[in-house]
Each structure stands twice: as structure tokens, then as C-alpha cells.
Interface confidence: medium
């Protein structure tokens, strides 16, 4: 179930995924949320005494049992990912943060009169993750009400300074704020040619430009389908990126599909999970756990259930069924995509709805009867 | 149109503007409305390009330097070429498109009539060819709809003109001896209409040509009297499908 | 199969004359325009001479105005390449090829080569 | 004439790599641009026609783009029999001049 609460003074033993800078145990909460492995999380308001770059780290942790060790530790803050709280899911951080600076790449600095408008800039900005904004109070008068937009590989600060007089927070995109607009067309059978930030598998374009939309980096993307003639690129989608912030003009390329991140979008901007069940398809990838339901979609609740599953495969083989039903296998990955996918006949795959804001059940509390 | 003047709004509300949207978006083709789901086009504009996704149609447009992000299109649901056609030899260069959704008919927006089979050896007066594309061989796509009056060329003439080509019954002729009036690149799938006994009827689709308004060069259109079996064919088994697959 | 076969190569003095053929099979002959195009050893492609499917009209490169002659004779389904006056300069291997698209379509032209021989080796020297 | 200039004149590059050639006209030649590939001791092969449309049989790793003057071709995963030299053509008008060529090598 959903474990809102934080931990004073306590720091989780282990289950060490990776490390971050955060202003915040909310942000670093968050952050861990929307990890695709992340169950528990650890932050360092107070910097301990020898290890000062340890400040406003926010360590990311997973446990087989959902569960690690604590130990006390003066200034720590721990908590539970939200990944299973359902409408507490929400990407958007609008806090501020006085007197401190979100390092990061400074790729573009001008003059303007407040935070907001700072804020609102970087918002606007189609690569700026966070902003520095200088008082007219700062030290250094050259620099005063000064508007830093910055951007990072990670999306979050390269490190975090107390510094008087500065304000630091994050772009508004997440909390669908943004007047970039909003490119929803998806070109068939064209690829983008700009610099691929990651890669990722997946079973359609759609599930790729979702996996664009909530990467840091990736302003659009392309998608090789299964009958993609390099048998590597099967399924792969390609998170891309450009420094002018729009992609070369597409090339013809059969089997391709190619599309924009919908990060800046206001009203379309879809939930980090995908609902669709893929039949004819089997996701491979870490297996977690195996149990026996009847149905896809019953298997597809299990995994929702189950929190460390990412994604899962139903077999409808002879040898994969019983009385109680079929194989309903749970599997993870260190991306929260399969590693491979294959196509077979007796199999349907999808993805855990951990991450959707509102988790549909199959049984309701309330049954409303039409005329 | 090379030689050709401005047209008015709702002049020609047949005409549509079959614009290919890739990262800019651009003029490719013409193309008629002959019914609130269909749009009749050259299938040469696709070749290359076969892929419905990245096409946007405009109606009830004069003026392509109007058209923004904001301005309405419509997509294609259904791609399709004449099974027969082959890009290296130019016969059967026709296309039908099935729109997503209907189009609502205005002043300036609405269907052109299709001739009869029987117009085949209908001999016509005033012809007219429309288009946004260049105005002159090495040219650029125009802003506003361009038209011009034409003569009709019969094939037996039209075929002189062209000793490498087969001009074919499926083809129709047009233009001046002297040049100077033609259709031109970006005028393709766009209309021949012509005024016949007191009605516009869509006489041809503009295809291919040497050059644009060569002298003794004349346009050659798909002759659309020749192909109606085949238009109300294929609109027939669009409806035949959408009817199975609709639900009970 | 399209197939075009290139003959009639070999060494010759400045000054002299040559006459290449190039047969060609597996496709309406008469309905393409035709191509020369050459390349000397190490250098890349030229492109010579053209005729247009009826051989109503040809078209030359201005270093072989004058002193070449392009021709086809369409019921042998054969191309030709009268050479006059030839120079060093000419050394090459000549390729015919065969013209792509019939058409100037109101949204597409472009003059390309589709298929080409496998070249026939002119060498000009004393 | 139109002069045609290609760049690079030659690269070496791994298998599965991307690959890119540029070709300029020194005028503007609306997309009537041809590429053409040629191993050694063989006739060339047709590609792309008309800037960005691939000859059939030709593997879709190939594509070109392109209008006026500048033009690229990409190969998106170079594959072993990719290697040779590479052309480009303008057929916007007579003579119809191709670039120096672009010698492709793979590593």
C-alpha cells in the first residue's frame, strides 16, 4: 500500500541505486518516485561533519522486501517512494528555495525583475530544468536580478551550495505550465538523425514517447518497429536530443516511427504508465516472482499490486496453465523497460500501473447500474 | 500556374491543398472534394511519400500564407493509388483519399461533379486549370490560388507533341500551341474543371508535362471520365468495410 | 532482367576514331532515354551524352561538343557512342545507362540513371 | 554549369555506425538531386532519386534530404557492404554534373 510518511533523523542501510543532489526530502521523494527501481529513499539536510558534499544528497534505494534497516543519523530525513499512492503521484515541484544554488550547466543568463519571472522563463525554456535567480542583494552586483537557466544530464543539480541572496528552483513543464506548446504529430516510417540521450525497448511509439516525455533529456524521439531491418534496433526506442532544441528534418525511413517528447504540454500530457496489454508479445527481462491468475488483466493488477514489478508476461502455453489459471510472470529491469521483446502466439505482456495517478480495479465499491 | 491570375475566396471550392508536414510543412499537391469524405488527387504526389500520417488537407483556402498551427485540416484515413499505376511510364496517375472525418460543405467549401462515363467524347469550351504552384519552370509555390483558362488538345494532336511518350485514352490534353499557359510542379493533383451545360464538371487531374508552358508542350491530365468505374468502385468498398466493421 | 552490355573499348591514337555500343535487354528499349556517363582511372563520374527514347533529341557535355555522336537504333535495342577526334583526355571507361523517369511530372523530375553497364575501357594514347 | 561539392571527400567508420555525406550546388537545384554508390571495379547503383526517394531493393538504412542547394545522405547503421565511394548528381539541367565523390571505408 501507499507509505506517505517521512523519517526524521533516520537513514536507510543499503540497497544503494544511485545518488543525487536535492534541495529537499520532498523533491528527493519525488525523485525517487518516479525512478523505475526506487523503493526507499534516504536525504541529508545537515552535511555530516568531515563529508560537507554530502549535503543535500538524496540517496535512492531498492529492497527485495520493501523494507531496509535504519540507523539515526542527525539531519536525515528517509521516507517511502509514492510509487503505489495513486493520487499523490505528481511530478511537479513549484517550491523555491531561498538562499541556495542549484548548480548545474548555465546555458543561458539574462536580466529580469523577479523569481516568477525567472521561473516562468526557464518554464518556457525547451532545455532548462532549473534556475538560479540572484536578488538585487547579491554580493557580486554585475550579477544582480539575474536569471540563471541550467540544465543537467540527470535533470537534477550537479550539486547544491548555500549561498545569500540566491534562489533556486525547478521548471514548471511537469506541472503542464509551459506556453512552448505542444507537437503531438507521430511521422510514420520517418527517423530523426540527432544525438540519441539514451535507448530504451519498447513494444509501439507510444510507450517510447511516454519514456521520452519523463526522461530529462529527450526532446523527441525514434521508434524502429519489429520488422525494422537491423534485427538490434527491433523495438528500440531512441531518446534523442539537439542543441537548437528541434530535430534535422526527418528522413524517409521505412519501419521507423518518430515523434516529440510531450513534456511542455499543457492538457495532453500523458501519466508515466502505459495501460495498453500487448497480445502476442512476451517482455523478457529480471524475473521477480511467478503466480497463476486467470486473465491478462488479473495478471496485470498482480504486478500493479506487487511494487518492485515493472512490467509482466501472461503464457497461455498448455504447459503454463492450471486450475487457478495461467503463468503470470512479474519481471524488472534496470530502465523499468523489458531487455528484449519477442513475439509469441500464446503470450500477452504490459506494464505495472503503479505510476498512474488513478489505479483502475476491476472490483469497485460502489457499482452504479445504468437505466 | 504559369500564366495564370488571382483567384477569388470560394472561386474554386473544390480545391484543396494537400500539404506534407514534416519538421516545416510544405505544399506538395492539389486536389478535388468530390464528395464530404473524398478527395481526388495524381498518384505521383505519393510516390516516395506513400504514408497518411504526414499529409494535411486544407479547405476552403485561398490564400497557403494564411494557413498557421491553428488553422483546421484535414487527415487522411485512407490512402488509395490505382493499383495499376507505375511511376516510370505515367498511365493510371490517380489517387483517392478517404478523410478521417467528414468535411463540412460551405460557400467555400464543397464538391466538384464528376463527369458521366458517357462524357468520354464530350467535346468542352471553357476549361479552367487552378493551383498554387510555380509560375514558371524554375519558380516557387504561390500564396494565393492562381487559375487560368485553357484550351482542350485532342489526344491525336497531343500525341504528335510528345513522340517519346504514350499519350494513352486514360490521358487528356491541354494548352496553347504558342505556350505561355500551363499548370506547373505543385499544381499536380489539382483540377481541369471545365463549364458544361451550365454546371463545373472535373474534367482532369493534372499530371505531368515537358517543362511548364513550352511552346507546342501542352499539360496532359488524367482523362476522370475514363476512371468513374473505378472512383465509385473503390468509394463503394470503403463503405462495404466500414459497415463490417462497425458495431452491431 | 534489365541488362546493358557495353563493347566496341580498346586503344587508340590521338586523333582517332572509335565507335561503342552498348545492347541492351529485359526492358521496352524504345520507351527510355539513354545515358553516357564515364569515369577515368581514379577520377570520378562524368556525365557525357543523352537521347531521348525516340532519338528526336540529344544532348552533350561541352569537352566532347562537336566530336562525339550519341545515336540508337531501337529495333536492334541498341546505343551507340560515335568518338572523333579523340584526345588523352578521353581515357576512360565508358558506361551507358539508362534514363529512370519518362516523366516531368507537375511534382517530380529528376533525370536519373537506374541501370548502368559494366563499362567498356577507352584508352587514348600514342 | 552547376558544380556540385561533396563532403567528405572520404571517411572511415565502424560497422553500425551512423553515416553522413553532404553535397552542395552552387545553385540552387530544387530537389532534383540523384545519389549513386560505386564499389571498386563495378558499375555504380542508383539510391536516392529526387533528394529523398529510394530506389527499390535499396535498404532503408539509406535516406536523403535535402532542397535548393544543400543535401545529405545518411546511411543510419553502416553495414560491411556499404564501403566504396559514393556520388551524388544534379539533373536540375543539362549538363547534369556529379560530385567528387565521397570514399566510404569501413574500419
Known amino acids: 500500500g501507499c507509505l506517505s510518511q517521512l523519517y526524521a533523523n533516520t537513514f536507510f542501510r543499503g540497497g544503494d541505486l544511485a545518488a543525487i543532489y536535492t534541495p529537499d526530502a520532498q523533491h528527493c521523494q519525488k525523485m525517487c518516485t518516479f525512478h523505475p527501481r526506487c523503493l526507499l529513499f534516504s536525504f541529508l539536510a545537515v552535511s555530516p561533519t568531515k563529508e560537507t558534499d554530502k549535503r543535500f544528497g538524496c540517496f535512492m534505494k531498492e529492497s527485495i522486501t520493501g523494507t531496509l534497516p535504519r540507523i539515526h543519523r542527525t539531519g536525515a530525513i528517509s521516507g517511502h517512494s509514492l510509487k503505489q499512492c495513486g493520487h499523490q503521484l505528481s511530478a511537479c515541484h513549484q517550491d523555491i528555495y531561498e538562499g541556495l544554488d542549484m548548480r548545474g550547466s548555465n546555458f543561458n543568463i539574462s536580466k529580469t525583475d523577479s523569481i516568477e519571472e525567472c521561473q516562468k522563463l526557464c518554464t518556457n525554456n525547451i532545455h532548462c530544468q532549473f534556475f538560479t535567480y540572484a536578488t538585487k542583494a547579491f554580493h557580486r552586483p554585475e550579477y544582480r536580478k539575474s536569471c540563471l537557466l541550467k540544465r543537467s544530464s540527470s535533470g537534477t543539480p550537479t550539486s547544491i551550495k548555500p549561498v545569500d541572496n540566491l534562489v533556486s528552483g525547478f521548471s514548471l513543464k511537469s506541472c503542464a505550465l509551459s506556453e512552448i506548446g505542444c507537437p503531438m504529430d507521430i511521422f510514420q516510417h520517418f527517423a530523426f538523425a540527432d544525438l540519441n540521450v539514451s535507448h530504451v525497448v519498447t513494444p509501439d511509439a507510444f510507450v517510447c514517447r511516454t519514456v521520452c516525455t519523463f526522461h530529462p533529456n529527450c526532446l523527441f524521439f525514434t521508434f524502429y518497429t519489429n520488422e525494422w531491418e537491423t534485427e538490434s534496433q527491433r523495438n528500440v526506442c531512441f531518446l534523442k536530443t539537439s542543441k537548437s532544441g528541434r530535430p534535422s528534418p526527418p528522413i524517409i525511413q521505412e519501419n521507423a516511427v518518430s515523434g516529440y517528447s510531450l513534456f511542455t504540454c499543457r492538457k495532453a500530457r500523458p501519466e508515466p504508465c502505459h495501460f495498453k496489454i500487448y497480445s502476442g508479445v512476451a517482455f523478457e527481462g529480471e524475473e521477480l516472482n511467478a503466480t497463476f491468475v486467470q486473465g491478462a488483466d488479473a495478471c496485470q493488477e498482480t504486478c500493479t499490486k506487487t511494487i518492485r514489478c515493472q512490467f509482466f508476461t501472461y503464457s497461455l502455453l498448455p504447459q503454463d496453465c492450471k486450475a487457478e489459471g495461467c503463468k503470470c510472470s512479474l519481471r524488472l529491469s534496470t530502465d523499468g523497460s523489458p531487455t528484449r521483446i519477442t513475439y509469441e502466439a500464446q503470450g500477452s505482456s504490459g506494464y505495472s500501473l503503479r505510476l498512474c495517478k488513478v489505479v483502475e480495479s476491476s472490483d469497485c465499491t460502489t457499482k452504479i447500474n445504468a437505466r | 500556374i504559369v500564366g495564370g491570375t488571382n483567384s477569388s475566396l470560394g472561386e474554386w471550392p473544390w480545391q484543396v491543398s494537400l500539404q506534407v508536414k514534416l519538421v516545416s510543412q510544405n505544399h506538395m499537391c492539389g486536389g478535388s472534394i468530390i464528395g464530404r469524405q473524398w478527395i481526388l488527387t495524381a498518384a505521383h504526389c505519393f510516390d516516395g511519400i506513400p504514408y497518411p500520417d504526414v499529409w494535411r488537407i486544407y479547405g476552403g483556402i485561398l490564400n497557403l500564407s494564411e494557413i498557421t498551427n491553428k488553422t483546421p485540416f484535414s487527415s487522411i484515413k485512407e490512402l488509395i493509388i490505382h493499383q495499376k499505376y507505375k511511376m516510370s511510364e505515367g498511365s493510371y496517375d490517380i489517387a483517392l483519399i478517404k478523410l478521417q472525418t467528414p468535411l463540412n460543405y460551405t460557400e467555400f467549401q464543397k464538391p466538384i461533379c464528376l463527369p458521366s462515363k458517357a462524357d468520354t467524347n464530350t467535346i468542352y469550351t471553357n476549361c479552367w486549370v487552378t493551383g498554387w504552384g510555380y509560375t514558371k519552370e524554375r519558380g516557387e509555390t504561390q500564396n494565393i490560388l492562381q487559375k487560368a483558362t485553357i484550351p482542350l488538345v485532342p489526344n491525336e494532336e497531343c500525341q504528335k507533341k510528345y513522340r517519346d511518350y504514350v499519350i494513352t485514352k486514360q490521358m487528356i490534353c491541354a494548352g496553347y500551341k504558342e505556350g505561355g499557359i500551363d499548370a506547373c510542379k505543385g499544381d499536380s493533383g489539382g483540377p481541369l474543371v471545365c463549364k458544361h451545360s451550365g454546371r463545373w464538371q472535373l474534367v482532369g487531374i493534372t499530371s505531368w508535362g515537358e517543362g511548364c508552358a513550352r511552346k507546342e508542350q501542352p499539360g496532359v491530365y488524367t482523362k476522370v471520365a475514363e476512371y468513374i468505374d473505378w472512383i465509385l468502385e473503390k468509394i463503394q468498398s470503403s463503405k462495404e468495410r466500414a459497415l463490417e466493421t462497425s458495431p452491431a | 532482367e534489365v541488362q546493358l552490355l557495353e563493347s566496341g573499348g580498346g586503344l587508340v591514337q590521338p586523333g582517332g576514331s572509335l565507335r561503342l555500343s552498348c545492347a541492351a535487354s529485359g526492358f521496352t528499349f524504345s520507351a527510355y532515354s539513354m545515358i553516357w556517363v564515364r569515369q577515368a582511372p581514379g577520377k570520378g563520374l562524368e556525365w557525357v551524352s543523352y537521347?531521348?527514347?525516340?532519338?528526336?533529341?540529344?544532348t552533350y557535355a561541352d569537352s566532347v561538343k562537336g566530336r562525339f555522336t550519341i545515336s540508337r537504333d531501337n529495333s536492334k535495342n541498341t546505343l551507340y557512342l560515335q568518338m572523333n577526334s579523340l584526345r588523352a583526355e578521353d581515357t576512360a571507361v565508358y558506361y551507358c545507362?539508362?534514363?529512370?523517369?519518362?516523366?516531368?511530372?507537375?511534382?517530380?523530375?529528376?533525370?536519373?540513371?537506374?541501370?548502368w553497364g559494366q563499362g567498356t575501357l577507352v584508352t587514348v594514347s600514342s | 554549369d552547376i558544380q556540385m561539392t561533396q563532403s567528405p571527400s572520404s571517411l572511415s567508420a565502424f560497422v553500425g555506425d551512423r553515416v553522413t555525406i553532404t553535397c552542395r550546388a552552387s545553385?540552387?537545384?530544387?530537389?532534383?538531386l540523384n545519389w549513386y554508390h560505386q564499389k571498386p571495379g563495378k558499375a555504380p547503383k542508383l539510391l536516392i532519386y529526387a533528394a529523398s526517394r529510394l530506389q527499390s531493393g535499396v535498404p532503408s538504412r539509406l535516406s536523403g534530404s535535402g532542397f535548393g542547394t544543400d543535401f545529405t545522405l545518411t546511411i543510419s547503421s553502416l553495414q560491411p557492404e556499404d564501403f566504396g565511394n559514393y556520388y551524388c548528381q544534379q539533373s536540375y539541367t543539362v549538363p547534369y554534373t556529379f560530385g567528387g565523390g565521397t570514399k566510404v571505408e569501413i574500419r
Open positions: 537521347i531521348r527514347p525516340s532519338g528526336g533529341r540529344t
Open positions: 545553385q540552387p537545384i530544387d530537389n532534383y
Open positions: 545507362a539508362r534514363g529512370g523517369l519518362l516523366l516531368w511530372f507537375r511534382e517530380l523530375k529528376s533525370n536519373y540513371f537506374d541501370y
